[in-house]
């Protein structure tokens, strides 16, 4: 039995289109093999009409195509301008026509309903606008023009040129009579409803000389587009509703079991709390189109979504909509990473951000989700080294551990840092993820001086105290710059058994700058890591001043001043609109922190993690 499945019977009418979906098990082989649509002949052979390799038979030229959707094991054959000659037996299949996996489909094209001669057919989506054209002869130019709807054997007046409007069409219909010489009037119906579907009759004049024209109006509900995304990943709904609603409030809603539609987000500021921190409504273009991005997809996000336009910011009958059916794949390619990371005031967090491992060269970004209005995500840092000014000295994006994960470190935490952050790249948009930073009670594990003033030409030692639980971790000092944090050369770390036993006197790693130069001014981080995985960090700012007194200077935590005040951002720094999320190259204008000079190098800077006694200080 073939695992390929589709509709056994498809019926339609002349002039119409069909869209035949065939389903197959989405194994790796099936996804990439040839897909075909062929017609069975009397001889039993099946002649290819269209295939996924681009072949289209002459009979189908310009009216058919085959589209494969490998991620969800579907391919679709669209055939337009059907004629009765298209009736017959077909196969949709994979591989070779004669011996591949296939499914039999019977297509029947009939003449269609008996419409009055000369009937014009209008096919329009619900919520859109239709313009019905009604010709008339010169002698009927001064006479009454009208549009009727045929319901069974009766005709119901819809609108006429004497200002009558049927209540069912109130505020959404108009009859236009052109200037002299043009022998056609038009009826425009906006915000079409399903109930508008049917046969209409245009009439000009009365009696035996009247002009009549039939119009068949077919109002279609939008076919939901299948969207198949990975758990923990991201989805983007692109919504293009047309210029006629460009200035009307927009929304995205999710259909519930009662068949009503709950607003997920709209341009009037409403947002479902279930999507807090993981949704953005990108500003609309001039044509009224907009998009909604949802990250951190959960199984419960599955469902039918509609986007639309209405002044109330929610679904109303007869307004244009677009539909999607979202399926969330639990066999996700996106690795699990913490959705909540906790840090203490004054401490730090190291956030692991997944990206598509096939895109190791892509630019990496980290932005702060802001919920105001439609939501936006101003960039804080990127892998090329741009960092927003108020994060100078306390934020860094590292390419490690690599192979599908990068790391973002944020230290000197305050309660203001609590919130939602997004990890993204300029590559695969489905890999956007969200992490929430929570600030909890507690003390930082790493202790460094608040700030340090070093004297030009002298020696500076900066201690960093760590608790026993970090004894097996690698300790490091690095000099922060807007392009990362350059690890400083390390001296011999002293007897290793001191760390194994976690001797009271060994819980110290010190940075030595000798001699201090102007280039040494800036931020330094003390940190712990395990291999390529970063743990806590602590930051200290070193200011350099002219020599006042001779001798080396040792700074212990007791003598350290308070941390320097954060630099205040000048109001000219542009906030990044959500739109930039679509194309991270738009971030290039973001204000850049001035480079903090040459890295401390050579033997001038060294890290020493021998005991604090040897440094001539004490450690609590």
């Amino acid at each position: 039995k073939s695992p390929v499945f589709g509709p056994q019977e498809v019926s339609s009418v002349e002039g119409n289109s069909v869209s035949i979906k065939c389903y197959y098990p989405p194994t790796s082989v099936n996804r990439h093999t040839r897909k075909y649509w062929c017609r069975k002949g009397a001889s039993g052979r099946c002649i290819t009409l269209v295939s996924s390799e681009g072949y289209v038979s002459s009979n189908y030229a310009g009216r058919a195509n085959l589209t494969n959707f490998p991620e969800n094991g579907t391919f679709v054959v669209n055939i337009a301008q059907l004629s009765r000659d298209d009736s017959g037996h077909y196969k949709c299949g994979l591989g070779i026509n004669s011996r591949g996996l296939s499914f039999d489909v019977s297509l029947e094209v009939s003449q269609g309903p008996e419409l009055p001669n000369g009937t014009e057919v209008y096919t329009v989506d619900v919520g859109r606008t239709v313009t019905i054209k009604c010709p008339f002869k010169t002698e009927n130019a001064p006479k009454t023009k009208a549009l009727y709807k045929k319901i069974g054997q009766t005709s119901v007046l819809v609108i006429d040129s004497r200002n009558y409007v049927n209540p069912n069409y109130k505020d959404r219909i108009r009859l236009r009579i052109p200037g002299t010489g043009q022998l056609i009037f038009t009826v425009v119906i906006d915000r079409l409803r399903l109930s508008d579907h049917g046969l209409y009759l245009c009439q000009a004049g009365d009696g035996s000389n009247r002009d009549e024209k039939n119009a068949d109006l077919q109002v279609l509900e939008p076919e939901p587009e299948l969207v198949y995304e990975d758990l923990r990943g991201s989805v983007t709904f692109h919504c293009a509703l047309g210029l006629e609603v460009a200035n009307v409030a927009k929304f995205l809603c999710r259909v519930n079991s009662r068949e009503t539609c709950d607003v997920v987000i709209n341009t009037l500021g409403k947002r479902d709390s279930a999507f807090e921190g993981r949704i953005l409504l990108n500003p609309q273009d001039k044509d009224g189109s907009f998009s909604v991005v949802i990250t951190g997809l959960r199984k419960e996000d599955e469902g039918r979504y509609l986007c639309g336009a209405h002044s109330d910011g929610q679904l109303q009958e007869g307004w244009p909509i677009q539909a999607w059916q979202l399926f969330v794949n639990e066999e996700s390619t996106i690795p699990r990473s913490p959705t909540v990371v906790k840090g203490v005031a004054g401490g730090s967090v190291a956030v692991l951000c997944p990206y598509n491992p096939k895109e190791s060269q892509s630019l990496k970004y980290w932005c702060l989700w802001e919920g105001a209005q439609n939501g936006r995500c101003p960039l804080l840092v990127e892998s090329q080294g741009l960092v927003q000014e108020q994060y100078e000295g306390r934020l860094s994006l590292l390419q490690e551990p690599g192979n599908g994960t990068f790391t973002v470190i944020l230290n000197q935490l305050t309660t203001q840092d609590a919130g939602f952050y997004w990890c993204l790249t300029n590559g695969d948009t489905r890999w956007r993820t969200t992490v929430e930073i929570k600030i909890i009670e507690g003390e930082p594990n790493l202790k460094v001086p608040g700030n340090v003033t070093a004297v030009l030409g002298e020696t500076l030692n900066i201690p960093c105290h760590f608790p026993c639980k970090f004894s097996s971790y690698e300790k490091y000092w690095c000099k922060w710059s807007n392009t990362g944090c350059q690890t400083l050369p390390s001296q011999d770390e002293g007897p290793s058994e001191a760390f194994v036993n976690c001797d009271e006197n060994s819980r110290l790693v010190s940075l030595t700058l000798n001699p201090v130069t102007r280039a040494d001014e800036g931020w330094y981080w003390c940190g712990v890591k395990q291999g390529h995985f970063y743990g806590e960090t602590a930051a200290v700012y070193v200011a350099v001043e002219e020599k006042k007194v001779a001798g080396s200077r040792y700074v212990s935590p007791a003598k350290a001043d308070a941390a320097p005040d954060e630099k205040v951002l000048d109001s000219g720094v542009r906030e990044i609109e959500n739109k930039a999320i679509q194309d991270p190259r738009l971030f290039a204008e973001e204000k850049v922190v001035a480079d903090t000079g040459d890295q401390a190098g050579g033997s001038r800077a060294s890290v020493d993690s021998s005991s604090s006694e040897e440094q001539g200080g004490s450690s609590k």
């Epitope: 499945f5 509709p7 056994q8 019977e9 498809v10 019926s11 339609s12 009418v13 119409n16 289109s17 069909v18 869209s19 035949i20 389903y23 969800n72 579907t74 269609g112 309903p113 096919t123 399903l194 077919q218 279609l220 509900e221 939008p222 076919e223 939901p224 587009e225 299948l226 259909v255 079991s257 068949e259 039918r304 539909a323 059916q325 399926f327």
Partner: nanobody
Framework: QVQLVESGGGWVQTGGSLRLSCAAS????????MGWFRQTPGKEREFVAA??????????YYTDSAKGRFTISRDNAKNTVYLQMNSLKPEDTAVYYC?????????????????WGQGTQVTVSS
């Protein structure tokens, strides 16, 4: 939500025929797959047939065992879907359910718990 009410079940001898009806209310079901499923005691519900339509095009889906014997159809004006079952066999004995779901993806799966009828019993005796 779509309310679905099945009828037409009953007792019939092998080779006989039955016509099941599924009346939908609550909204028009033009954007839905309307499916028939069946269930025998201790077993999972299994797909029998489904129908969908877009404008004046109709798509009918059947399981292998139903092909050639069962016909699914609809009456738009009555918002009703039918399953004409001919050449019935004892193995067709089951409770038959009508179900509805948005017209997207494979019509054999992912029917929402809310959009099922209460079922109608079909018994085929030899």
């Amino acid at each position: 939500q779509v309310q679905l009410v099945e009828s037409g079940g009953g007792w019939v001898q092998t080779g006989g025929s039955l016509r099941l009806s599924c009346a939908a209310s609550g909204r028009t079901v033009s954007s839905y797959y309307m499916g028939w499923f069946r269930q025998t005691p201790g077993k999972e519900r299994e797909f029998v047939a489904a129908i969908s339509w877009v404008g004046s095009s109709t798509y009918k889906y059947y399981t292998d065992s139903a092909k050639g014997r069962f016909t699914i159809s609809r009456d738009n004006a009555k918002n009703t879907v039918y399953l004409q079952m001919n050449s019935l066999k004892p193995e067709d004995t089951a409770v038959y359910y009508c179900a509805a779901r948005p017209r997207v993806g494979d019509p054999r799966s992912r029917y929402d718990d809310d959009n099922w009828g209460q079922g109608t019993q079909v018994t085929v005796s030899s």
